[in-house]
């Protein structure tokens, strides 16, 4: 079993990358002198207790920053948040910490990230760009839910 996080870089089909701005992840066109975040990801070690055939359940963090992506309801709306959290602390918990887990599905070069806590809600960016990452259940033209994930070895 791999028990250290893997590192990766992410961009969407419009070649926008994820950048950290004021503790918020936003998607912007790649430019010179820009520092896209490096993603840290690790599979949940309790995979047998989660839904099968939905994707690989993973914790998603920002490499070297002790920040992890999580989903929480604000009012009735599931929202995507960054929380100060060590990804390995999540990994080692005796149960899956669903609010921090995403089902990672791959189809060709495209990856999607579905909230485990809120099935049917996916990490997305607005098609306009320069906007924060969000959770959406509308898989249409307004939001992009397909990402390219390149693992860094």
């Amino acid at each position: 079993k791999i028990d250290t996080p893997q590192r990766g870089s992410i961009q969407d089909i419009n070649h926008r990358v994820w950048v950290l701005q004021d503790q918020t992840l936003i998607a912007v066109p790649r430019k010179d002198r820009m520092s896209p975040v490096t993603i840290a990801l690790i599979s949940c070690r309790h995979v047998e207790t989660l839904e099968k055939d939905r994707g690989n359940p993973i914790y998603l963090g920002l490499n070297g920053l002790n920040l992890c992506l999580m989903c929480a309801k604000v009012g009735d709306q599931p929202t995507l948040q960054l929380k100060e959290k060590d990804i390995m602390d999540l990994y080692n918990q005796p149960e899956p910490v669903k609010s921090f887990l995403f089902y990672h599905s791959q189809s060709g070069r495209n990856s999607t990230f579905e909230s485990v806590a809120f099935p049917g809600w996916f990490i997305a960016v607005s098609s306009e760009g320069g906007c924060p990452l969000i959770l959406t259940q509308e898989l249409g033209k307004a939001n992009t839910t397909d990402f390219g994930l390149t693992m860094l070895f």
Epitope: Q93, E95, S99
Partner: antibody, heavy 121, light 109 residues
């Protein structure tokens, strides 16, 4: 407020089955894990198993595999423990508990009042 | 299967400090055992005190603290109150299953 209310005491004959319920209020059981624990007279606690009500997946202590069956009815926010092939040594108080992640750890934060199951011929 | 052992009974004076321990038959308890502590007062339901070895559950008074002490999980009550008289149970994780101790009956006298 958050509450777990269990069904009443049961008296069963050896070989019979029993189903104990645990009705939750003040939270949605799909948002947490429900654990079942028992306490035989004058004894400590024994973990029976747990269920993830959102998905229905279970974990059991090896001792209770095949003896206990955990289920939920999310429409009524209720968890169930069914025990089969009862023997006198299954006489105990059975508890349900919420095992929830808050901040940085999982805690047993709320418990049912317990259900006494007596197995006697 | 692992056996988890606690002191059967302990006594503390009001305002005093007492440490309850939780020993594992498999060796030293570590943070990987994610020790939990629960309390049962006479005639009342259980309440959770500690999770993850040393994290206090929400709403638990600061006089309760969890730690590792000499290869055992420990629950320390600093400035014990009469209402702390109760049974205390620890539980340790071993991979994918949980094992409870036999409990400690704490008397505040």
């Amino acid at each position: 407020q958050v509450q777990l209310v269990q069904s009443g005491a049961e008296v069963k004959k050896p070989g019979a089955s029993v189903k104990v319920s645990c009705k939750a209020s003040g939270f949605n059981i799909k948002d947490t894990y429900i654990y079942w624990v028992r306490q035989a007279p004058g004894q400590g606690l024994e973990w029976i198993g747990r269920i993830d009500p959102a998905i229905g997946t279970t974990r059991y202590d090896p001792k209770f595999q095949g003896k206990a069956t955990l289920t939920t009815d999310t429409s009524t926010n209720t968890a169930y423990l069914e025990l089969s092939s009862l023997r006198s040594e299954d006489t105990a108080v059975y508890y349900c508990a919420r095992y929830d992640y808050s901040g940085s750890s999982f805690y047993f934060d709320y418990w049912g009042q317990g259900t006494l199951v007596t197995v006697s011929s | 299967q692992a056996v988890v052992t606690q002191e059967p009974s302990l006594t503390v004076s009001p305002g005093g400090t007492v440490t309850l321990t939780c020993r594992s038959s498999t060796g030293a308890v570590t943070t990987s055992n994610y020790a939990n502590w629960v309390q049962q007062k006479p005639g009342q339901a259980f309440t959770g005190l500690i999770g993850g070895t040393n994290d206090r559950a929400p709403g638990v008074p600061a006089r309760f603290s969890g730690s590792l002490l000499g290869g055992k999980a420990a629950l320390t009550i600093s400035g014990a109150q009469p209402e702390d008289e109760a049974d205390y149970f620890c539980a340790l994780w071993y991979s994918n299953h949980l094992v409870f101790g036999g409990g400690t009956k704490l008397t505040v006298l």
